[in-house]
Interface confidence: low
């Protein structure tokens, strides 16, 4: 049966006994700035190109052992959510991965900046179709990271980021607080904001919309055919990156403003239980859960 | 991580001691009425003191960025400080990433073309 998260983002007009979403996103390249990935996983094999970009801090602790499957875990799962053969949103999208997070899932603002610069330079050297950049990471508010995101967005790149898993105002974090970035919070199968231990999804006016982010089935780096369930605003952001890729593939000339408008337009409205949010944040937090456009307007590429 | 350590870690073999250059004496004064600002992460445990992103004004060319970085190294060297330019930015934002002592911030903020300086900080998978 179709995983709950894919069903949630799929409008009724797609639905049949079997989940067969359009093979969308084929005109779009999605850049993933995350951990290293297992590019030969069957979910993403041939769909993800690992760039030679790597800018990560050393792992903390003298006893830390780099285990490939652990190092690749976060990025592999997200690549699968975006474009995985079985459990991906935009099955036609091609991806490029940049390593900006170490085996502990930690990176730096400077490393992320250099990664964004790498993307811009790649875009200038070899202009392709629409670009989506997925930033499934968060740090404290950073003027320079927000500024770099703004510049990249003004160059026509769509940036999608995690709202953060701190059960806090997303405006206190970057790149979530960057106005030009599409910032995504996480909801679960019950349309509740996701709780993660004692924390949970961020909220507030810097969040653009929510997407499935709890118990998301995706590629596991434990083996080339393994699947695992992961939760977080990264997973939510990956759904929106996939939806954006499909929309941009359908209409490559969409501006960021139009894309944002359409993401909001096709979202399920007023389904999130707002009682989870602090009272003063309820009116500021968008009650929107991302969804694909009806298939009438999906642009399919049969190659 | 290593990139975010203070210079006191003894890792001097990597660092280049910038010699005083001729152009050090030709430092332009910062534009009148503009003051560069310093920013750092509000979440203390996530701060990475010792590494700084020096952001230059929008229209600054790569050659000016490189020149400003060299000037910083030269002026720091005169004061007995080691610095290392880790990356020169161009394409998105003009500027450079420098590994240096926080003692040099005041000096760096007065360099020509500087818009603001931000201390590096951690980001995390979500």
């Amino acid at each position: 049966s179709i995983p709950w998260n894919l069903e949630r983002i799929t409008p009724p007009r797609y639905r049949a006994d079997e989940y067969q979403p359009p093979d969308g996103g084929s005109l779009v390249e999605v850049y993933l700035l995350d951990t290293s990935i297992q590019s030969d996983h069957r979910e993403i094999e041939g769909r993800v190109m690992v760039t030679d970009f790597e800018n990560v801090p050393e792992e903390d602790g003298t006893r830390f052992h780099r285990q490939a499957s652990k190092c690749d875990s976060h990025g592999t799962h997200l690549a699968g959510v975006v474009s995985g053969r079985d459990a991906g949103v935009a099955k036609g999208a091609s991806m490029r991965s940049l390593r900006v997070l170490n085996c502990q899932g930690k990176g730096t603002v400077s490393g992320t900046l250099i990664g964004l610069e790498f993307i811009r330079k790649s875009q200038l050297v070899q202009p392709v179709g629409p670009l989506v950049v997925l930033l499934p990471l968060a740090g404290g508010y950073s003027r320079v990271l927000n500024a770099a995101c703004q510049r990249l967005a003004r160059a026509g790149v769509v940036l999608v980021t995690a709202a953060g898993n701190f059960r806090d105002d997303a405006c206190l974090y970057s790149p979530a607080s960057a106005p030009e970035v599409i910032t995504v919070g996480a909801t679960n199968a019950q349309d509740q904001p996701v709780t993660l231990g004692t924390l949970g999804t961020n909220f507030g006016r810097c969040v653009d919309l929510f997407a499935p982010g709890e118990d998301i089935i995706g590629a596991s780096s434990d083996c080339s055919t393994c699947f695992v369930s992961q939760s977080g605003t990264s997973q939510a952001a990956a759904h929106v990156a996939g939806i954006a890729a499909m929309m941009l593939s359908a209409e490559p000339e969409l501006t960021l403003a139009e894309l944002r408008q359409r993401l909001i337009h096709f979202s399920a409205k007023d389904v999130i239980n707002e009682a989870w949010f602090p009272e003063d944040q309820r009116v500021l937090t968008p009650n929107l859960v991302a969804a694909l456009p009806p298939s009438t307007h999906e642009n399919l590429y049969f190659q | 991580g290593a990139m975010g350590q203070e210079d006191e870690d003894g890792d001097y073999e990597e660092l280049v001691l910038a010699l005083r250059s001729e152009e050090d004496g030709l430092a332009e004064a910062p534009e009148h009425g503009t003051t560069a600002t310093f920013h750092r992460c509000a979440k203390d445990p996530w701060r990475l003191p010792g590494t700084y992103v020096v952001v230059l004004k929008e229209e600054t060319h790569l050659s000016q960025s490189e020149r400003t970085a060299r000037r910083l190294q030269a002026q720091a060297a005169r004061r007995g400080y080691l610095t290392k330019i880790l990356h020169v930015f161009h394409g998105l934002l003009p500027g450079f990433l420098v590994k240096m002592s926080g003692d040099l911030l005041e000096l760096a903020l007065k360099l020509p073309h500087v818009d603001y300086i931000e201390e590096d900080s951690s980001v995390f998978a979500q």
Partner: antibody, heavy 119, light 109 residues
Amino acid sequence: EVQLVESGGGLVQPGGSLRLSCAASGLTFSNFWMSWVRQAPGKGLEWVANIKQDGSEKYYVDSVKGRFTISRDNAKNSLYLQMNSLRAEDTAVYSCTRESNWGFAFDIWGQGTMVTVSS
Amino acid sequence: QSVLTQPPSASGTPGQRVTISCSGSSSNIGSKTVNWYQQFPGTAPKLLIYSNNRRPSGVPDRFSGSKSGTSASLAISGLQSEDEADYYCAAWDDSLNWVFGAGTKLTVL
């Protein structure tokens, strides 16, 4: 320039059949849902049917279900409407339209072909 | 009987602002975007407004659309004689049909 040109209209007796064609040019035809919209003389617009990019999904207005069949040939950049058991109330100008891939809209229209059902 | 309800006619003098309404239900306008088409006699309709309020390129900014609940409206400001035409609203419906209004004939007095 994107163009849709309809053909195949004409005068037919009630109960008769017609096959309308629409030739598309200037667009990647296989990327779009396509529709037929009709307009009876002096009346408003009425959507008739539409078809998915690969032909795997088709929808019809209730009044033509079981009588009309929409189809397409992507290799020929062509859209068709097979009309059987025609009735007087099917008399209209039939236009082929492209459904935009965004925004729920018919963004390109053909000039239409007239179908008259009369004895 | 059209699924969407429009006034059969509307009129205004040059320079005036004219509004045409379109009423539907939760299965169409209430949950979908609305489009407006302009049709001159003997010609094919032209997309005027899509996604409630967006103008395709080439459509003057005198034309604007809005939606509230299960109703939508088309406003034409600075009315000009060349705006005399038929105007249709349309939306996708949960019944898996496109639905149109019966059309409004705009007369410029």
